[in-house]
């Protein structure tokens, strides 16, 4: 029985050409988590965090993407293009998979900001 | 006592292939990611490829991606590195190292004595 | 990939001379920063994991420190068997890259 729920930065906000953190957090379980994915709306991935061999950035994201803080991914030189849905998916022992998604805006404007509150989608 | 011991090497043409071996033993194998990390005449370390204890997780440096493939065999406590099209540049000592150990911050804490690869005509 | 720049990249000094090694990394790794010792025709032994912890077996001489993208590993006092090349490796993302190297030789 999956117990766990994923908390998420939510619908989040940033400017062009600055960067951002996209969080997940699992909660409510004693899973042990094998592997987190970041991907992005188009399906694509970005990186990996294997709890075993740490982070691996794709090739077409290295320039643009960070890994962490903890288990989150920084994005970086941020275009109108990064607008979209982003989706951290957990890998767990025994409970199986649970996915969360952030819906990042990017802004034209220099006076966006960035709104970082957690919630459960 | 922990041991690697590596085989397999030797002189091949530009263009041919080699299957390089690592036992393993005095640990429990198939709980413990794996690396290969080369090192040329005289230059430093480069790392080449890790692989997760089930072997579900494989990563390459990208100047070996595409032609070197990296696998285990835990009933057999066994390393392997399949190098197909090989260059003169691939030619070097080949350790395999266990670890790295993400989620334990570890290194790669042991060692085997290295196997020479030649790769000439 | 994370780049990893060591210096100097070799030095000279004395049985009993304190010694220090700096690694940099191009992006934050926290703590996931190693060294390893090599001697010529051997493999490397790891010394220091997580950029501060003692490797079991390895003398207290050896110690690390630093974090984030900023990484030192000190011998305390040198002894004739700790003249080798050291590297610094992070182990955060894939390429698990190393720096340079430091060729530790006698004066």
């Known amino acids: 029985m999956m117990t766990g729920t994923i908390e998420t930065t939510g619908n989040i906000s940033a400017k062009k050409g600055g960067s951002v953190i996209l969080q997940c957090h699992l909660s409510s379980t004693m899973a042990q988590v094998t592997q987190v994915n970041w991907e992005q709306h188009d399906h694509s991935l970005l990186a990996i965090r294997n709890a075993e061999l740490g982070w691996h950035i794709y090739p077409a994201f290295k320039d643009r993407v960070a890994p962490g803080p903890g288990l989150g991914l920084t994005l970086q030189s941020l275009t109108m293009n990064d607008t979209g849905e982003y989706f951290c998916t957990y890998h767990t022992y025994p409970d199986g998979t649970y996915r969360g998604r952030i819906f990042l805006e990017v802004l034209e404007s220099s006076v966006a900001e960035h709104s970082a509150r957690f919630q459960i989608p | 006592e922990v041991q690697l011991l590596e085989s397999g090497g030797g002189l091949v043409q530009p263009g041919g292939s080699l299957r390089l071996s690592c036992a393993a033993s005095g640990f429990t194998f198939s709980t413990y990611a794996m690396s290969w990390v080369r090192q040329a005449p005289g230059k430093g370390l480069e790392w080449v490829s890790a692989i997760s204890g089930s072997g579900g997780s494989t990563y390459y440096a990208d100047s070996v991606k595409g032609r070197f493939t990296i696998s285990r065999d835990n009933s057999k406590n066994t390393l392997y590195l399949q190098m197909n099209s090989l260059r003169a540049e691939d030619t070097a000592v080949y350790y395999c190292?266990?670890?790295?150990?993400?989620?334990?911050?570890?290194?790669?804490?042991?060692w085997g004595q290295g196997t020479t690869v030649t790769v000439s005509s | 990939d994370i780049q990893m720049t060591q210096s100097p990249s070799s030095l000279s000094a004395s049985v009993g001379d304190r010694v220090t090694i700096t690694c940099r990394a191009s992006q934050s790794i926290s703590s996931y920063l190693n060294w390893y010792q090599q001697k010529p025709g051997k493999a490397p032994k790891l010394l220091i994991y997580a950029a501060s912890s003692l490797q079991s077996g390895v003398p207290s001489r050896f110690s690390g420190s630093g974090s984030g993208t900023d990484f030192t590993l000190t011998i305390s006092s040198l002894q004739p068997e700790d003249f080798a090349t050291y590297y610094c490796q992070q182990s955060l993302a894939t390429p698990y890259t190393f720096g340079g190297g430091t060729k530790v030789e006698i004066k």
């Open positions: 190292a266990k670890g790295p150990r993400y989620q334990d911050r570890a290194g790669m804490d042991v």
